[in-house]
Interface confidence: medium
């Protein structure tokens, strides 16, 4: 399986909400011996490998923000901890999983990584990640709502988190 980032860059005004999204695609084993662990963290663009370093998002670690389930099941963080920090991660039946960040500030700007670990009990763990940039802007040059730039082309799309 692979992870695709629908958008490689999100540009948002301060105070807005944004939902960063990744999608798991390719063959997904739905056997009872296979589970998926999905999470989010901040990182930096390393010289060797992007998303290698794991930094917290608003003081919450990747462990705090994880989802854990079998196959393409729906799940979401119900952690009070995450919600108190204006964060919520979620996963749907179609392989999409996301993190919603509320009331963005300039400090939220940076590189965000989604991580998926496929756990085949007794055999192996296979992990893949996706990366995307979030730019939070303020002042007259800031957009009125979030603009997302697709990974594959330069056409932008206006998005607003619910």
């Amino acid at each position: 399986f692979k992870v695709a980032t629908l958008y490689s860059l999100y540009v948002c005004p301060e105070g807005q909400n944004v939902t960063l999204t990744c999608r798991v695609f390719g063959p997904v084993d739905k056997g009872h011996d296979v589970t998926f662990y999905k999470t989010w963290y901040r990182s930096s663009r390393g010289e060797v490998q992007t998303c290698s370093e794991r930094r917290p998002i608003r003081n919450l670690t990747f462990q705090d923000l994880h989802l854990h389930h079998g196959g393409h099941q729906a799940a979401n963080t119900s952690h009070d901890l995450a919600q108190r920090h204006g964060l919520e991660s979620a996963s749907d039946h179609h392989g999409n999983f996301s993190i919603t960040m509320r009331n963005l500030t300039l400090l939220d700007s940076g590189l965000y990584c989604c991580l998926v670990v496929e756990i085949r009990h007794h055999h192996s763990e296979h992990r893949v990640h996706g990366a995307m940039e979030l730019q939070v802007q303020t002042g007259k040059d800031a957009p009125s709502s979030c603009v997302a730039y697709p990974s594959s082309s330069q056409e932008s799309e206006n998005i607003t988190a619910a």
Partner: antibody, heavy 118, light 106 residues
Amino acid sequence: EVQLQQSGPELVKPGASMKISCKASGFSFTGYTMNWVKQSHGKNLEWIGLISPYNGGTSYNQKFKGKATLTVDKSSSTAYMELLSLTSEDSAVYYCARRAYGYAMDYWGQGTSVTVSS
Amino acid sequence: QIVLTQSPAIMSASPGEKVTMTCSASSSVSYMFWYQQKPGSSPRLLIYDTSNLASGVPLRFSGSGSGTSYSLTISRMEAEDAATYYCQQWSSYPFTFGSGTKLEIK
């Protein structure tokens, strides 16, 4: 604060069985695997196996199959390792450690010393 | 199973000296992890995913490598770094540790 509190030292007779506990606190128990590691003579570390409190799934090092049995009690956030048919070779310090998937064992218990002697 | 061979088994260094130890895997692994253990204490995570410092680890520690060859470096040895260091792989079951490198202070 993340803590893994293991049960105290044990002196057991050859052929007996025993159970070590590891009580977790300060984190979401089901978001991690609980791993067990053996350290003999203060030297080599050996991974015994893991259990996922999320679904009870276990994975064992083949070397320890039949020797160790891993269980969890989600209600008390406690992991257990039962050691069976003990011999002098099983004398060691045993550690529990939490591990997030795709990561490392970032918190360890203080260790439980097991001495097998008649 | 993947066998991890650490060298040297024992080494000593003076304060301020640069220290490098290696970990060789019998077959290729995706990432290496390093732990530090002092006598009477539990192992402590130092480095994850080959080159990233775990929380609270001093910047004088660094890790590098790929495939079957990995290393841990301490840029300037300090007395508190005297310990045994273990490498570990999570790439395939059973997860294995190296035999350790004991680092002593001169």
